[in-house]
């Protein structure tokens, strides 16, 4: 059962399994729902203790019942992980604590000239978990305004101690805000010599991977796969750091594999969901239960649901005894990995999908591609919405997409004349414009936020951000695009696709059935060529084929520009404007969102 | 031992500038700033300015703004303080002192080393 | 600019007495005060810092006191090693700021 409470002046007795500093309970709920065996936690404030050193203490705990008894004890704060809750976990915090210093390896000084950009400086320097910042009140004077950069093994602080006039908080990499690199290749061959700050076993590189981005001390890894030559070795995920970040030796191994943490773009990977089976693979750990199933992904389902199990190895029937079930044995281990990992056993294991409401939804897989054809499938852009007017009569105005549970992306033009929110319907999970009905439900507009740059389309800053009145409700039909990563900059999309209920051709009406076209970006210089009468920035990206004939138009306004990479959607650009439709040598130009990544982010986690 | 050695003794002409330097061991180099103070034959303690090695910014008193520049060199420990348009008051010692520890916040600190002193000159 | 202003200019003392120094500020440095010695021909030598903590190797019989604009270095029991120039300096404002000194010398 889910309980988001915090309950004041409750003590958890017993279940201790850690403890670590936090600056505040709400943060220490977060730290436990993230920790691999952490179900409930005690949180110590200022007024619990009169010794300082047992201020901001969080201390981790696990029952195998999945409670504890409680003791009244004034200044604690009890409360139970996000593990049980089915919505949305974020690591990212952005809160600032005010009179508190966050103890750690403080291993950078400067000057800054306020705590924001002091924030900013820790977001995108490579080993910075947090910082604490000295204000201009600070009493030493060559101390004010100090930007103290800090790091710890665990990610979290070593100690919390109050000290007047400064403030703290921590690294925003978790919230999509760095500026840093995202280095997404997995090395083939490579084995990086650099100094190990842990090992795990995993049963890929992609999970290693995944745990490396997870680690908060992790900056790369090798893995060694099943074929590796040293069998004690075999199936190891080495979690690496260096000083510069980078490593410094990369040592030819065949049968290994290296690469880097994602954390500056884990908002637009799946971090935590291991979704993968591996078959004739078994997880060893200690074991929670064994339950009699039919395959292994009602193995997985029931890991799932056990809130303690952490993987899991299902042993199929034998011939056909026990009606075709086999045994599923529920796992875990102390840092949520498995102890050892057999091969050759004929288990088919895999992990708890529990985790998976840790990243971002829209990293979730979606339906494969319809290949052929103009006309999309239900659940093929779950993203894709259109956006009705209701003056003077109904119709749809523009498209938009899904980039977060109540938040719309669309292009600021498409606001032309519009004077409320009051006359806008956001119809979601729509594939043909006819199942819109006098009674088909849909989502009012609570709040138009233009980009305050806005002039006209074609000078740029068309972009525009939609609140619902109310929350969508994630399904295969209906769920978030991923913006794409700052750390991403150089990556080149070559799958892209534009989608939109507009007309066809230029002199056309509204399609019923929305469509969808493969069309190949093209570079901001060719782009300007054909648009000589027209300065193309930045902020804005191009595509479209050379010949013509594949374009968005009008009524596709709003509309994503969805690129494929790495198995995730990105929404790369918006529908904008173009000269003609589908005109040769006439490109259609779109918003480049990841020029806007910050003032997305800065409207909606306002 | 931590230690600040600086530079000889400069006889300069009034117009001239004066580089003198100020090599620092035995501590972590980037880790505190470094005062410049001069003193006048027979006078008291004047403050010049303040240099900060890790990420090289400075502030300077009122009294030497455009003429003073201090400076430094990570990989050789070493900060500068260089005075131009030189003229016969600047005669004096001058001190190269280390100030705060600046990868701890802590309220009251004070100049705990000092260099031996380099005599600077200006004489027509 | 804050003024530092140390009186008296000159103080002569018998070895083994009380010495008392004192250090006005234009304004309040709050407790940003620091006491320095400098013997002719040295360098100046970190005695006191936040008006009241004393540096490290600095003998007990040098304290400091005050807050605001008012303090005072006290020297319990004159040694012959303490015969020399003492600066106050203030941490509170740029620029630095020094007192003018307080010369200790042998009654």
């Known amino acids: 059962e889910c309980v988001t409470r915090l309950f004041k002046d409750i003590h958890f007795e017993g279940g201790d399994i850690a403890t670590v500093f936090t600056p505040s309970a709400k943060h220490c709920q977060v730290v436990c729902t993230h920790h691999p065996r952490c179900l409930l936690f005690t949180f110590t404030g200022e007024s619990a203790s009169e010794d300082p050193t047992q201020w901001f203490t969080c201390v981790l705990k696990d029952s195998v019942t999945e409670t504890l008894p409680r003791v009244n004890r004034t200044g604690a704060i009890s409360g139970y992980s996000f593990k049980q809750c089915s919505h949305q976990i974020s690591a990212c915090n952005k809160d600032i604590y005010v009179d508190l210093d966050m103890k750690g390896i403080n291993y950078n000084s400067s000057l800054a000239k306020s705590a924001q950009e002091c924030q900013e400086r820790c977001t995108d320097d490579i080993h910075c978990h947090f910082f604490t910042y000295a204000t201009r009140q600070f009493p030493s004077l060559e101390h004010r305004n100090i930007c103290l950069l800090k790091h710890t093994q665990t990610g979290t602080p070593t100690g919390i101690m109050k000290l007047d006039k400064v403030v703290t908080g921590f690294s925003l990499k978790s919230c999509a805000l760095s500026n840093l690199a995202c280095i997404r290749d997995v090395f083939p061959n490579t084995v990086f010599a650099d100094s190990n700050i842990d090992s795990v076993m995993a049963p890929d590189a992609f999970v290693c991977r995944r745990i490396c981005t997870h680690h908060p001390g992790c900056l790369f890894f090798t893995f060694f796969s099943q074929e590796w030559p040293k069998e004690s070795q075999r199936n190891l995920c080495l979690l690496k750091t260096s000083e510069s970040g980078l490593p410094s030796t990369r040592i030819k191994k065949s049968k290994a594999l290296s690469g880097f943490s994602l954390q500056s773009c884990r908002h637009s990977i799946p971090v935590f969901c291991h979704s993968s089976f591996y078959h004739d693979t078994d997880f060893l750990g200690e074991e929670l239960d064994i339950v009699a199933v039919k395959g292994h992904e009602a193995c997985q389902k029931l890991c799932t649901n056990a809130v303690r199990c952490q993987f899991f190895t299902y042993a199929p029937a034998q011939a056909s005894c026990n009606e075709g079930k086999g045994k599923c044995y529920l796992k875990l281990s102390s840092n949520g990995s498995p102890t050892k990992i057999l091969r050759g056993t004929g288990g088919i294991s895999g992990y708890t999908l529990r985790l998976c409401k840790m990243d971002n939804e829209c990293t979730t897989k979606i339906k494969p591609r319809i290949v052929g054809g103009t006309a999309s499938v239900r659940g093929e852009w779950p993203w894709q919405v259109t956006l009705h007017t209701t003056s003077p009569t109904q119709r749809h105005l523009c498209g938009g997409s899904i980039i977060g549970n109540q938040w719309i992306l669309t292009a600021a033009h498409c606001f032309y004349g519009v004077e409320s929110p009051k006359i806008l319907r956001v119809y979601i999970g729509i594939l043909n414009q006819s199942e819109i009905k006098e009674d088909t439900s849909f989502f009012g507009v609570q709040e138009i936020i233009i980009h305050d740059q806005y002039k006209m389309a074609e000078s740029g800053y068309d972009i525009a951000l939609l609140k619902l009145e109310t929350t969508v409700n994630y399904t295969d039909s209906q769920r978030p695009i991923c913006l794409p990563s700052k750390g991403d900059r150089n990556v080149i999309y070559t799958d892209c696709w534009v989608t939109g209920w507009g007309y066809r051709k230029l002199r056309d009406k509204i399609q019923n059935t929305l469509q969808k076209a493969k069309i190949p970006l093209v570079t901001n210089d060719e782009c300007q060529k054909r648009y000589r009468g027209h300065k193309i920035t930045h902020k804005m990206i191009c595509a479209g084929y050379r010949e013509g004939g594949k374009d968005a138009c009008k009524g596709d306004s709003g509309g994503p520009l969805s690129c494929k990479h790495n198995e995730v959607w990105h929404l790369v650009g918006i529908t904008s404007w173009g000269e003609g439709c589908a005109q040769r040598e006439r490109p259609g130009v779109y918003t480049n969102v990841l020029e806007y990544v910050d003032w997305i982010l800065e409207k909606t986690q306002a | 031992e931590v230690q600040l050695v600086q530079s000889g003794a400069e006889v300069k002409k009034p117009g001239a500038s004066v580089k003198v330097s100020c090599k620092a061991s035995?501590?972590?180099?980037?880790?505190?700033?470094m005062h410049w103070v001069r003193q006048a034959p027979g006078q008291g303690l004047e403050w010049m300015g303040i240099i900060n090695p890790s990420g090289g910014s400075t502030s300077y008193a009122q009294k030497f703004q455009g003429r003073v520049t201090m400076t430094r060199d990570t990989s050789t420990s070493t900060v500068y303080m260089e005075l131009s348009s030189l003229r016969s008051e600047d005669t004096a010692v001058y001190y190269c002192?280390?100030?705060?520890?600046?990868?701890?916040?802590?309220?009251?600190?004070?100049?705990?080393?000092w260099g031996q002193g380099t005599t600077v000159t200006v004489s027509s | 600019e804050i003024v530092m202003t140390q009186s008296p200019a000159t103080l002569s003392v018998s070895p083994g007495e009380r010495a008392t120094l004192s250090c006005r500020a234009s304004q309040s440095v709050s407790s940003n005060l620091a006491w320095y010695q400098q013997k002719p021909g040295q360098a100046p030598r970190l005695l006191i810092y936040g008006a009241s903590t004393r540096a490290t190797g600095i003998p007990a019989r040098f304290s400091g006191s005050g807050s605001g604009t008012e303090f005072t270095l006290t020297i319990s029991s004159l040694q012959s090693e303490d015969f020399a120039v003492y600066y106050c300096q203030q941490f509170n404002d740029w620029p630095l700021t020094f007192g003018g000194g307080t010369k200790v010398e042998i009654k």
């Open positions: 002192a280390r100030g705060a520890y600046l990868l701890e916040l802590y309220y009251y600190y004070g100049m705990d080393v």
């Open positions: 035995g501590y972590t180099f980037t880790s505190y700033s």
